[in-house]
């Protein structure tokens, strides 16, 4: 379905508001350091041009591809070389290489200041004075910090952001109304960004076969009543949507996502009984709702899988005829029966099944060879079950902060070369698995925990790829997507690591500690803990706990003192000396 003008086609499909929002997101994700006003100017120019193409699709340049149009526009930025260095070299390339070049320069950890939330009255005034600019600024600030954020979903977040201000700026207690909503949007936004980053990593590093396998497993769990052909169609469409978004083709992605939502709502009867309430909602909300929809009930009396996949004499014949289809059906059948398994476990089982068939279908007696294949699954299933049980028990024992500290120590000992900020960020997020998943019923714990851990560990992989420092991390990140988490779990203490020299400056604290929020205080303490482990990797957890308890006491004492700075100056060196003695 070709169009004379791609830009006109997308403008008409999406409407002006969504078109402008998506172009702003695309530009902000590519040129993450450019000022807001510059992006708004570029977006307005693109929008005016799109309107001329809507009026006359044969007008000059209207037949150009979106990559050509957008790339040409980005390359007009005057300060490209000064601001972005070698990214400016992308502009010397032709499409499609130019777009690939821009994609490669997306920065997962841009050097941008943390977003500071102004006073509620200040925000409400800004919202009322110029609502459009206020919302554009939100899209810009989120997109430049999260260059792989799922763009159509970001439009949904912006709609919720707008609704929060529209409601709360009228409220009697604006802050009480608004702040919890903004906190929720921030936390959900970070989670959404991290989940999408894993999808993009899956596509870009492991190919669309890996993503399709993930999607077959997940959609089969969600839609166990749907037939394999239906699930396959949804997987194909979903893969196209995410390939486009991860590739920077945000207009096509949003358009295709809307088409997918429309298809699902028109075919609910053959997909899931849970879609009904999603389908009554407006587009952005509907797509979000469909993506988050709960698993449908499993059909009653599903037959045993063994008949078709172990006992049948035709297993090797069926496998040889269409390997990927046969494995896809196996994965579909297994996943629809196991909403209690993580997607990553299901993919490991499919991989193990594939390896067994590859070996056994070449053997003298294939049936005899693969007869016990399901028994081989048991250890694979028990490993994440044990991991979740063990982690949840420890979380229950320690609480979130101390559980994070246990993980910080564990991961710092495994990969001490990784930067301290990365270890703190990743371990804090790994530790959040407890509050997120351990309260759930047994049947939901593993899918919650292991699939969440995969998202967090992907963040480690993405950050590490930018600045590689550990062969062990590179190995776990690149060898197998589905085995990343078990690979990290199995890492041992790095015996070759040379302890970091002691630096007193790292353990020097000031009165500004006292004005920090509870979260910021925790991050400071956890940063010190990581540095401590890097300095003394053989220290026992008991020793480290003692030092951390003393640290907390020292900070509390000085924050209660009349002259806080003097207290820190006097007590700090004592704390450092005592800590060194305790760890000697």
């Amino acid at each position: 379905d070709t169009h004379k003008s791609e830009v006109a086609h997308r403008f008409k499909d999406l409407g002006e508001e969504h078109f402008k929002g998506l172009v702003l997101v695309a530009f902000s994700q590519y040129l993450q350091q450019c000022p807001f006003e510059e992006h708004v100017k570029l977006v307005n120019e693109v929008t005016e041009f799109a309107k001329t193409c809507v009026a006359d699709e044969s007008a000059e340049n209207c037949d150009k591809s979106l990559h050509t149009l957008f790339g040409d526009k980005l390359c007009t930025v005057a300060t490209l070389r000064e601001t972005y260095g070698e990214m400016a070299d992308c502009c010397a390339k032709q499409e499609p290489e130019r777009n690939e070049c821009f994609l490669q320069h997306k920065d997962d950890n841009p050097n941008l200041p943390p977003l500071v939330r102004p006073e509620v009255d200040v925000m409400c005034t800004a919202f009322h004075d110029n609502e459009a600019t206020f919302l554009k600024k939100y899209l810009y600030e989120v997109a430049r910090r999260h260059p792989y954020f799922y763009a159509p979903e970001l439009l949904f977040f912006a709609a919720r952001y707008k609704a929060a201000f529209a409601e709360c700026c009228q409220a009697a207690d604006k802050a009480a109304c608004l702040l919890p909503k903004l906190d929720e949007l921030r936390d959900e936004g970070k989670a959404s960004s991290a989940k999408q980053r894993l999808k993009c990593a899956s596509l870009q590093k492991f190919g669309d076969r890996a993503f399709k396998a993930w999607a077959v497993a997940r959609l089969s769990q969600k839609f166990p009543k749907a037939e394999f052909a239906e699930v396959s169609k949804l997987v194909t469409d979903l893969t196209k949507v995410h390939t486009e978004c991860c590739h920077g083709d945000l207009l096509e992605c949003a358009d295709d996502r809307a088409d997918l939502a429309k298809y699902m709502c028109e075919n609910q009867d053959s997909i899931s009984s849970k879609l009904k309430e999603c389908c009554d909602k407006p587009l952005l909300e509907k797509s979000h709702c469909l993506a988050e929809v709960e698993n449908d009930e499993m059909p009653a009396d599903l037959p045993s899988l063994a008949a078709d996949y172990v006992e049948s004499k035709d297993v090797c014949k069926n496998y040889a005829e269409a390997k990927d289809v046969f494995l896809g059906m196996f994965l579909y059948e297994y996943a629809r029966r196991h909403p209690d398994y993580s997607v990553m476990l299901l993919l490991r089982l499919a991989k193990a099944y594939e390896a067994t068939l590859e070996k056994c279908c070449a053997a003298a007696d294939p049936h005899e060879c693969y007869a016990k294949v399901f028994d081989e699954f048991q250890p694979l299933v028990e490993e994440p079950q044990n991991l979740v049980k063990q982690n949840c028990e420890l979380f229950e024992q320690l609480g979130e902060y101390k559980f994070q500290n246990a993980l910080l120590v564990r991961y710092t000992k495994k990969v001490p070369q990784v930067s301290t900020p990365t270890l703190v960020e990743v371990s804090r997020n790994l530790g959040k698995v407890g509050a997120k998943c351990c309260k759930l019923p047994e049947a939901k714990r593993m899918p919650c925990a292991e699939d969440y851990l995969s998202v967090v560990l992907n963040r480690l992989c993405v950050l590490h790829e930018k600045t590689p420092v550990s062969e062990k991390v590179t190995k776990c990140c690149t060898e197998s997507l589905v085995n990343r988490r078990p690979c990290f779990s199995a890492l041992e203490l790095d015996e070759a690591y040379v302890p970091k020299a002691f630096n007193a400056e790292t353990f020097t604290f000031h009165a500004d500690m006292c004005t920090l929020s509870e979260k910021e205080k925790q991050v400071k303490k956890q940063t010190a803990l990581v540095e401590l482990v890097k300095h003394k990797p053989k220290a026992t957890k008991e020793q480290l706990k003692g030092v951390m308890d003393n640290f907390a006491a020292f900070v509390e004492k000085c924050c209660k003192a009349d002259d806080k700075e003097a207290c820190f100056a006097e007590e700090g060196p004592k704390f450092v000396a005592a800590s060194q003695a305790a760890l000697a």
């Epitope: 044990n386 049980k389 063990q390 982690n391 028990e393 420890l394 229950e396 024992q397 320690l398 246990a406 993980l407 120590v409 564990r410 000992k413 779990s489 199995a490 890492l491 041992e492 203490l493 026992t540 957890k541 008991e542 706990k545």
Partner: nanobody, 122 residues
Framework: QVQLVESGGGLVQAGGSLRLSCAAS????????MGWFRQAPGKERVFVAT???????YYADSVKGRFTISRDHAKNTVYLQMNNLKPEDTAVYYC????????????????WGQGTQVTVSS
């Protein structure tokens, strides 16, 4: 000073049983995970079994159904009942403890005993 002292090792015929004990001292261990690793000649130390502060148990696949780990919180002691022993179970068995006990790798455990030899003859 934390100490873990194993006992109960020895020579046994294949198919026989042994019960290992590990007495912990130097502090209270009621919140610790405690367990057992083993090391066969020329091999790495490998996980055998562990028991959490809540008395949840975890076993290596190779010993599941044959070995049982248990603990007595009051006595700061952990036990390993080994039934239907096989020649491949021959190893030095080490008692371990850790205040967090997260994981199944040797480096996940801070405290180790000296080990007790178990030899299974065929």
């Amino acid at each position: 000073q934390v100490q873990l002292v194993e006992s109960g090792g020895g020579l046994v015929q294949a198919g026989g049983s042994l019960r290992l004990s590990c007495a912990a001292s130097g502090r209270t261990f009621s919140n610790d995970a405690m367990g057992w690793f083993r090391q066969a000649p020329g091999k790495e130390r490998v996980f055998v079994a562990t028991i959490s502060w809540k008395s949840s148990t975890y076993y290596a696949d190779s010993v599941k159904g044959r070995f049982t780990i248990s603990r007595d919180h009051a006595k700061n002691t952990v036990y390993l009942q080994m039934n239907n022993l096989k020649p491949e179970d021959t190893a030095v068995y080490y008692c371990v403890a850790d205040p967090y006990g997260l994981g199944f790798n040797p480096s996940d455990y801070d405290y180790w005993g000296q080990g007790t030899q178990v030899t299974v003859s065929s």
